[in-house]
Interface confidence: low
């Protein structure tokens, strides 16, 4: 996270780290004791296998991640249209062998409902242990931000994206840059209080560099997603 | 605005994944056309930010809020694992309907053993002129002590 | 730069309604990152905390001043308002409104300069 | 409600000290706490949030650590214009409360 602040403890308690060989890749969020929605793109070919993966939940700092509750994975579902190139559908869901124990540090956020407005520039906040700026290491604490939603005709814009977003994509971040997701954030959320919940509304999936003017950055489109979500959780539960 | 487009006629239903459109009155018809066959496990949902429990009726080729009537919490954990929270059930209660709804899903009680949707049909009165809303999961909440808010 | 300002009455009668606004400007009252409170301060004693608001309406008030109190927000005049009724000499205080970050870092971070309400006959 | 109580209820100091005022939760908070300046007839003004976190413009001799129950706000060389009283909030559970503050005088 480009220009964020470090979480306190219990502030994003969704957020889950995926780590590959003892490595952080990838965010995840929880959405069940048993299921974790990170991004298609993370579980590409060759890491499209359960067994690389675990997920570690409730702890704050990747170097004290093994302190902290540590699933392995059972199964990885990428989203049966995710496309590599474009980045479309960049969605996918991770079954846990044991399932989570909820406490002040591990909950799940809630997935969106139809019929849900947002807001022209809907506050919203990324989360994760990416980059603090482009082309830096992950970060060792887990850091978050605030980003206003872009409504897509507006990121479609010559000036922006010039047509790269699709419905199944939603742009979040500040026109003039400063504050955006990078890279090692993928696969973590972008959620939005409302009612005074927190809901689900994006997996963190691409941009053009982090923190870049008029390069704000994407995410999967989680409400576009509920229906195969809730799909895949009634077929391999 | 909605972060919402969908491929299909007004008429018609989506089928997902598969992105495959279907007349809206074979929906929830009980006969699988989608696919993966989500137009027969895709007939409850919950809706909007206050999570009412809606039905989709194939008759009438829309959802609806499922009346407070009769309503236990038995059948809202019946609804969750519908939905796909097979472990999974927070709360089930009524709410006011704020919607102005004029038309209902309601339970009919004496339908016997039968599939929750089955028990169900379309009505123009609820009097309780409550919805029922289910929360399958205790979701986006920060701290076990914020949620007395 | 977001400012709050508090207006309102300085006497209020005994048993009559406290009633008070507070406008906010350089910034949107309908924004889900804050919650606006109203926190009060006798004379020569400390600081409590009698409610908040969120642009959606939903509200918060401490328990004893529950049943007296009322915070409502208008939207369309970028302001949001205290109601107390049936007040006595005891809820004569410098009331000060003030934006309550909501998600995670919390603390009162902007305030309004206070306004004195005395309640006297 | 939670109350919290701040230790001393005065302090008398010179410019230069090291001042150190505590808050005690009467239950566990995490990191939900946040501290303020109020001088004579102004407004109350953020120093620290999220317990130990300097709110942007702060000088940085104020600093807050703690974490649970026990919390601590140290002035590391007092200045005259940090004369002033000090108030603790919780925001974990509402009511939110404040202490009942700690007025640091000149010796």
């Known amino acids: 996270i480009v220009g964020g602040l470090n979480a306190s403890p219990g502030d994003w308690p969704w957020q889950v780290s995926l780590h590959v060989q003892g490595v952080h890749v990838c965010g995840g969020s929880i959405i069940t004791p048993e299921w974790i929605v990170t991004a298609a793109h993370c579980v590409e070919e060759p890491l499209s296998s359960p067994r690389y993966w675990t997920a570690f939940a409730g702890i704050l700092r990747q170097s004290l991640m093994f302190y902290g509750s540590r699933h392995q994975v059972e199964k990885v579902i990428s989203h049966p249209n995710y496309d590599s190139k474009t980045k479309n559908n960049d969605i996918a869901l991770m079954k846990l062998q044991t399932p989570l124990a909820f406490n002040d540090l591990v909950k799940p956020v809630c997935l969106p409902n139809p019929g849900m407005m947002l807001d022209l520039d809907q506050e919203c906040w990324i989360s994760g242990w990416g980059a603090t700026y482009e082309k830096g290491k992950t970060s060792d604490v887990l850091n978050a931000a605030m980003v206003p939603l872009i409504e897509p005709s507006k990121c479609n814009s010559k000036y922006i994206y010039n047509n790269l977003i699709t419905p199944a994509m939603i742009c979040a971040g500040f026109l003039q840059g400063s504050v955006d997701s990078c890279q090692g954030d993928s696969g973590g959320p972008l959620v939005t209080l409302k009612n005074g919940i927190w809901w689900l509304i994006g997996d963190t999936s691409w941009g053009s560099g982090c923190a870049k003017a008029l390069r704000p950055g994407v995410y999967g489109n989680v409400t576009v997603f509920t229906d195969w979500i809730y799909q895949q959780m009634r077929a391999n539960s | 605005w909605r972060f919402w487009d969908s491929n299909c006629s007004t008429s018609e239903m989506e089928c997902g994944s598969s992105g495959t459109c279907i007349s809206s009155s074979l929906w929830c018809d009980g006969v699988a056309h989608c696919p993966n066959g989500e137009d027969e496990n895709r007939c409850v949902r919950l809706y909007g930010q206050s999570f009412i429990l809606q039905v989709y009726s194939s008759q009438r080729k829309a959802w609806y809020p499922v009346c407070q009537d009769d309503w236990s919490e038995s059948y809202g954990r019946a609804a969750c694992k519908d939905m796909g929270y097979k472990n999974n059930f927070y709360s089930s209660q009524g709410i006011p309907d704020q919607s102005g709804a004029t038309s209902f899903m309601k339970l009919n009680v004496s339908s016997g053993n039968v599939d929750l949707y089955k028990k169900l049909y379309h009505s123009d009165s609820c009097s309780s002129r409550m919805v029922v809303s289910l929360r399958c999961i205790e979701c986006g909440v920060r701290s076990v002590k914020r949620q007395s808010r | 730069q977001l400012q709050l300002q508090e207006s309102g009455p300085g006497l209020v009668k005994p048993s009559e309604t406290l009633s008070l606004t507070c406008t906010v400007s350089?910034?949107?009252?309908?924004?889900?990152?804050?919650?606006w409170g109203w926190i009060r301060q006798p004379p020569g004693k400390g600081l409590e905390w009698i409610g908040s608001?969120?642009?959606?309406?939903?509200?918060y008030y401490t328990p004893s001043l529950k049943s007296r109190v009322t915070i409502s927000v208008d939207t369309s005049k970028n302001q949001f308002s205290l109601k107390l009724t049936s007040v006595t000499a005891a809820d004569t205080a410098v009331y000060y409104c003030?934006?309550?970050?909501?998600?995670?870092?919390?603390?009162?971070?902007?305030w309004g300069q206070g306004t004195t309400v005395t309640v006297s006959s | 409600d939670i109350q919290l109580t701040q230790s001393p209820s005065f302090l008398s100091a010179s410019v230069g000290d090291r001042v150190t005022i505590t808050c005690w939760a009467s239950q566990g908070i995490s990191r939900y706490l946040a501290w303020y300046q109020q001088k004579p007839g102004k407004t109350p003004k953020l120093l620290i949030y999220a317990a130990s976190t300097l709110q942007s413009g702060v000088p940085s001799r104020f600093s807050g650590t703690g974490s649970g129950t026990d919390f601590t706000l140290t002035i590391s060389n007092l200045q005259p214009e940090d004369f002033a009283t000090y108030y603790c909030?919780?925001?974990?559970?509402?009511?939110?409360?404040f202490g009942q503050g700690t007025k640091v005088e000149i010796k």
């Open positions: 608001i969120y642009y959606d309406r939903n509200t």
């Open positions: 350089g910034g949107s009252i309908n924004s889900n990152s804050y919650y």
């Open positions: 003030a934006r309550e970050q909501v998600p995670g870092y919390y603390g009162m971070d902007v």
């Open positions: 909030q919780q925001f974990d559970s509402y009511p939110w409360t």
